[in-house]
């Protein structure tokens, strides 16, 4: 008989263990929901304000009718200033008028003053031609003013009022482009 | 946690065509750009194409002319399309999402192989 209540006090012990872990399961799964909650109405609360502000362009970005861009503080390789522009939703600047060139230039004048700035302009190897990371031709005028002496991958760059060439795996600034939000207005 | 689930890969012949898609699924608020990267044997992993949240493009030289990327934002799904294959495009091949808190998810990658 004590051994049949000893039992029944063990199994009843067992069951209350039980309990008390979901109860405490069920405690970590609220806090994590509350957690959740809390992220998702702080970045709804984000959206709406930044969509109320709606500023066409980020903080520390210009911007040009259509176009954002961000001029670096940092210097890396070509490869890496492009994917630094994709981190941000951007793509290394792709110049696709004389007038965006004038932006560009003057805007880096007041800005920063002399210094070579990374655009997305590459040369193929094999054929030789330039083109944007997009695939497209640069318009003649936006050709890159000395052909560089490498054996490396070649790249354009912005120094000045000057489109330039050089090897892709020297450090430079380098500057992003992304489209500016349109106003729903 | 995001999981990236990529497929579409694997064996075809020199000039032939293949195309990678990539399902981003789980936790993700806000992408700012997907791509797709690429590791060769013995060599280093390199960016092939890339699309931003707004639809601008970056391809690789290598990639220029012969491969498309494309997106489907509502689905969180990027396409690369890969035509006149050579045998130097043999490599696995990694879709990536930089997204907005500015950290980079990647996919388990998938083998493409072209032979001659």
């Known amino acids: 008989k004590l051994l049949q209540v000893s039992t029944i006090a063990m199994q009843q012990q067992e069951k209350l263990i039980q309990q008390e872990r979901a109860l405490l399961n069920f405690t970590e799964w609220k806090r994590s929901c509350a957690l959740q909650m809390k992220y998702c109405q702080a970045f709804m609360q984000n959206s709406l304000s930044s969509a109320h502000n709606s500023s066409p362009c980020p903080n520390n970005w210009i911007q040009n009718r259509e176009s954002c861009y961000y001029v670096s503080e940092i210097w890396s390789i070509w490869h890496t200033s492009q994917e630094n522009c994709l981190k941000e939703g951007s793509t290394l600047l792709q110049i696709e008028s004389k007038e965006e060139m004038d932006f560009i230039t003057g805007s880096l004048r007041k800005i920063k003053g002399s210094y070579d700035y990374w655009v997305g302009l590459s040369q193929d190897g094999h054929s030789g031609r330039w083109l944007w990371q997009d695939g497209s031709s640069p318009s003649p005028g936006l050709l890159p003013a000395e052909r560089s002496q490498s054996a490396n991958q070649v790249c354009g760059y912005v120094k000045s009022n000057s489109l330039l060439s050089s090897n892709c795996s020297t450090w430079k600034y380098f500057i992003c482009e992304k489209y500016a939000l349109r106003s729903s207005v | 946690q995001v999981q990236l689930q990529e497929s579409g890969g694997g064996l075809v012949q020199t000039g032939g065509s293949l195309r990678l898609s990539c399902a981003a699924s789980?936790?993700?608020?806000?992408?700012?750009?997907m791509g797709w990267y690429r590791q060769a044997p013995g060599k280093q992993r390199e960016l092939v194409a890339a699309?931003?949240?707004?639809?601008?493009?970056a391809y690789a030289d290598s990639a220029k002319g012969r491969f498309t990327i494309s997106k489907e934002s509502a689905r969180n799904t990027v396409h690369l399309q890969m035509s006149s294959l050579k045998p130097e495009d043999t490599a696995v091949y990694y879709c990536?999402?930089?997204?907005?808190?500015?950290?980079?998810?990647w996919g388990q990658g998938t083998q493409v192989t072209v032979s001659s």
């Open positions: 699309i931003t949240v707004g639809g601008r493009l």
């Open positions: 789980g936790s993700i608020f806000n992408i700012n750009s």
């Open positions: 990536t999402i930089w997204a907005a808190d500015y950290q980079q998810y």
